[in-house]
């Protein structure tokens, strides 16, 4: 059984940096394993080496540790449009990203989907597409922004937010999304 994180932190703080307290003998501090390795056996006693083994293929540790097992490498999720930027090594997890002219949208802290950057047809680029943010478009007169695309005011129904933007006007309409269609 792995002790709760707080207990492990408490135990580690008894030893100098780079060492951890022996689980069976709290008077002994063992050297932590380097990144890319994991703890196979605790050190037998003070001044003796910890038995660390290299992570097997498909697993990694990214920092010094006393883990009993390496962590499994992440897989890029093809169904979310993700591509592999760099493959997993013993000391670094897989890095996933998006293709050129796409951005990441995070549905949650650890799940993102790749979407094409908006081209701002019938408008102009107000802010360029970035790694984690779509292009921000400014629509030409006679168009309103819906789902980050500039749509003709002829498609504006009276019930929608666009009615404010599609009144006769001379100025460009900037980035107020039509909230009535999503």
């Amino acid at each position: 059984l792995v002790p709760p994180l707080r207990d492990r932190e408490k135990r580690d703080s008894v030893c100098p940096q780079g060492k951890y307290i022996h689980p069976q003998n709290n008077s002994v501090c063992c050297t932590k394993c380097h990144k890319g390795t994991y703890l196979y056996n605790d050190c037998p006693g003070p001044g003796q080496d910890t038995d660390c083994r290299e992570c097997e293929s498909g697993s990694f540790t990214a920092s010094e540790n006393h883990l009993r097992h390496c962590l499994s490498c992440s897989k890029c999720r093809k169904e979310m449009g993700q591509v592999e930027i760099s493959s997993c090594t013993v000391d670094r997890d897989t890095v996933c990203g998006c293709r050129k002219n796409q951005y990441r949208y995070y549905w949650s802290e650890n799940l993102f989907q790749c979407f094409n950057c908006s081209l701002c047809l019938n408008g102009t680029v107000h802010l360029s597409c970035q790694e984690k943010q779509n292009t921000v478009c400014t629509c030409h007169a006679g168009f309103f922004l819906r789902e980050n695309e500039c749509v003709s005011c002829s498609n504006c129904k009276k019930t929608l937010e666009c009615t404010k933007l599609c009144l006769p006007q001379t100025e460009n309409v900037k980035g107020t999304e039509d909230s009535g269609t999503t």
């Epitope: 897989k75 093809k78 169904e79 549905w107 989907q113 979407f115």
Partner: nanobody, 119 residues
Amino acid sequence: EVQLLESGGGLVQPGGSLRLSCAASGFTFAHETMVWVRQAPGKGLEWVSHIDRVGQDPYYADSVEGRFTISRDNSKNTLYLQMNSLRAEDTAVYYCAVLPKRGPWFDYWGQGTLVTVSS
């Protein structure tokens, strides 16, 4: 016309189980990645799980990993969510949806089914 109809929600005690179903029509179900999302009272949408077209390598949110199982039957155009070891914090309206393609919004999703976990 795309239709997604969820069922199987209800009142269950903590530790109990429920199986949600989502009957799909109006599109080629077997060609789409399908998603379960939920909305707890007074909160935003939370991604629960998704499953690709062939039902391999499902994704689960950390909050449901090991307790929920997503599956699909392409011959029946139906998506499922088996929910075990239910907790009070799983109380929410559960929606099934088609994975978006054009942008981060759901074009197609159901009306939802309410799951209440309470003793």
